[in-house]
Amino acid sequence: FNMDTRKPRVIPGSRTAFFGYTVQQHDISGNKWLVVGAPLETNGYQKTGDVYKCPVIHGNCTKLNLGRVTLSNVSERKDNMRLGLSLATNPKDNSFLACSPLWSHECGSSYYTTGMCSRVNSNFRFSKTVAPALQRCQTYMDIVIVLDGSNSIYPWVEVQHFLINILKKFYIGPGQIQVGVVQYGEDVVHEFHLNDYRSVKDVVEAASHIEQRGGTETRTAFGIEFARSEAFQKGGRKGAKKVMIVITDGESHDSPDLEKVIQQSERDNVTRYAVAVLGYYNRRGINPETFLNEIKYIASDPDDKHFFNVTDEAALKDIVDALGDRIFSLEGTNKNETSFGLEMSQTGFSSHVVEDGVLLGAVGAYDWNGAVLKETSAGKVIPLRESYLKEFPEELKNHGAYLGYTVTSVVSSRQGRVYVAGAPRFNHTGKVILFTMHNNRSLTIHQAMRGQQIGSYFGSEITSVDIDGDGVTDVLLVGAPMYFNEGRERGKVYVYELRQNLFVYNGTLKDSHSYQNARFGSSIASVRDLNQDSYNDVVVGAPLEDNHAGAIYIFHGFRGSILKTPKQRITASELATGLQYFGCSIHGQLDLNEDGLIDLAVGALGNAVILWSRPVVQINASLHFEPS
């Protein structure tokens, strides 16, 4: 109707990076920008994704290099993390959130795709990492190896080999395992502290240089106490699981101290593995019973999990795997390992700013049934799996509903702010829920809408619209972009209007009647009044229309509802040649060129497009006859 299609500003970017996947208009003290997500952008050797700031009138885009942001104390994997897959602007302070839902970190032998977001302040400076689903690894362990280096240990090289082999099994790195080694005989010395080395390679290198210090006495109690009171303190981390591995070849010369030493270790929650090396006993034909009892006493209970004995130093290599496996069986403690909580949550797949924080969709949470998490300045709210059961029953738990594929919120005069989330795969047809979140990790689900058609992806896009700008939501639009009709993926947008406290179905928006795939409803944007009639409007993207060139549809708001017939359809081919997937993202909240009219930003594959609004001239015709 009044969007200019003759002089769009087409901002080019990388197609391979999918520059344009998300777009947001941005205002910094009067200067207008587009923030553009490029979730496949490369940073160095990694395809991290990134976000660009683009001036709206002329000039080139600048990469914000958010892909370089690193989290300390985790072993991160940023490759393919899809930074920029979701963007959410906070109009209050003009900060925005850029999410990397496939950001993952190493935990033992697994990579956990918890996702994370970067908060960027109004002047495009990174300010904070938001990662509510990030949990400590079960391999967050401080391991101190207590090595008997007394004279009777022979040959030392076998002990060294054992040490190196066991270290190679450890997942050493930030947020995972730290290893320290002490050696004892008559005295105890730190060979290296817990925080001296940060990789397996470095620890192994250090261990290969440990020499036998000797000693006529074997003061095992002293060695254990030294490890407990000193080694775990120097470089030890708060909250890390404390593990001690004691390797000795004979009865201790200070065994009367063991009772108190072990009591103190228990008090400090040190899990003790103890290895009895029987070489000295076997070489001399001595009965090792007393020695074995002592080592069992040192080992944590139960002995069958924590106690090992080997015939001689050379046989140490035979227990490397078993010892490693026992230590890492601590990973699964009290967990049903066939089930995922937040480990694969992909938090930030969608995002939405609310008054007190940000809502983040986590499609992979709870075995891909999904969840919505909330991060506030006061902390985070992570609803329990059980809180969704009312609408996501147990019997469908293996279906992967993908709740959190999109998140938004509505405001009703009675209930205030209510959150909305889509689960496009729920029971194959899709579902949308309206809910409030509580600090005790429960939810109150107020309403649910279900999709009609299997595979339609109902709920993959949701937008709330305040038509008259009174602060109360009038219309909720739900996209089902894969809706199949007349032999094609046509797409459908469902309209729900607020009546008292419920949203009531009120038909669908009309698209154009073409015989190709369209995916109408892939993106739905509530935009400020485009046609100057004082009602806010809606723009819907159909990025597969016109043989994947894409198109957008403009629907006008009117008296608390939305007119279901589009007032303007803009195809990519009208604007520029070579545009593809035009309409994959849309944002229209700002006047970008200072003409007093709201302008549109539309994403495409490798491009961001700005469409300028034109003024609407109201002509009131009146006939005047003379003589009357």
Partner: antibody, heavy 120, light 109 residues
Framework: EVQLVESGGGLVQPGGSLRLSCAAS????????IHWVRQAPGKGLEWVAS????????YYADSVKGRFTISADTSKNTAYLQMNSLRAEDTAVYYC?????????????WGQGTLVTVSS | DIQMTQSPSSLSASVGDRVTITCRAS??????VAWYQQKPGKAPKLLIY???SLYSGVPSRFSGSRSGTDFTLTISSLQPEDFATYYC???????????FGQGTKVEIK
């Protein structure tokens, strides 16, 4: 030659204090444990307290807990038994003895004993 | 705490007799049991350690054995210098708490 020599015994009034010493020679106190054992007139042996000179861990018999304190000074190769709030039933000959790994945790060397008499 | 019950409390025997003294532990203990000999006015002397090992310098007529929670000191042929009081002693494992038996006085018949 291994030797343990006790000193510090004597007559003390009930409620009084005494400090016994056990001077060790011929071995290093640091690698052993010292026990104090007492024997009341005409009675059997009663274990009193022990110390690991190396770690300073201590153990006490219930009858003396809170009143007696065992300590060691490895630089002087001497162990001590500080006895406070003495009672008539603490009257005994007090022996110190060595306890270590090489005697399989038996008391292999004993001092000659020092007599403590608690009487008004 | 483990109690060591020693029996008999006294016995009369002649030179050349075989003498047996028993200590019973109140609960299962390690083999860290020792036997001492004490003569009037003297400090005790170690005879047996680890239940059955003869301490150096101790005549071989002295021996020790264990059966479950029962520990036995045997003097195979009593000599005049053996008339004394004998004590068993148990060491609590992994601590330096020790317990003595009540003693057995061996007198000349």
């Amino acid at each position: 030659e291994v030797q343990l020599v006790e000193s510090g015994g004597g007559l003390v009034q009930p409620g009084g204090s005494l400090r016994l010493s056990c001077a060790a020679s011929g071995f290093n106190l640091d690698s052993s444990y010292i026990h104090w054992v007492r024997q009341a007139p005409g009675k059997g042996l009663e274990w009193v307290a022990s110390i690991s000179s190396h770690s300073s861990y201590t153990y006490y018999a219930d009858s003396v807990k809170g009143r007696f304190t065992i300590s060691a000074d490895t630089s002087k190769n001497t162990a001590y038994l500080q006895m406070n709030s003495l009672r008539a039933e603490d009257t005994a000959v007090y022996y110190c003895a060595r306890y270590w790994y090489y005697s399989a945790w038996a008391l292999d060397y004993w001092g000659q004993g020092t007599l403590v008499t608690v009487s008004s | 705490d483990i109690q060591m019950t020693q029996s008999p409390s006294s016995l009369s025997a002649s030179v050349g007799d075989r003498v047996t003294i028993t200590c019973r532990a109140s609960q299962s203990v390690s083999s860290a049991v020792a036997w001492y000999q004490q003569k009037p006015g003297k400090a005790p002397k170690l005879l047996i350690y680890s239940a059955s090992s003869l301490y150096s310098g101790v005549p071989s007529r002295f021996s020790g054995s264990r059966s479950g929670t029962d520990f036995t000191l045997t003097i195979s042929s009593l000599q005049p210098e053996d008339f004394a009081t004998y004590y068993c002693q148990q060491s609590a494992p992994y601590s330096s708490l020790i317990t003595f038996g009540q003693g057995t006085k061996v007198e000349i018949k």
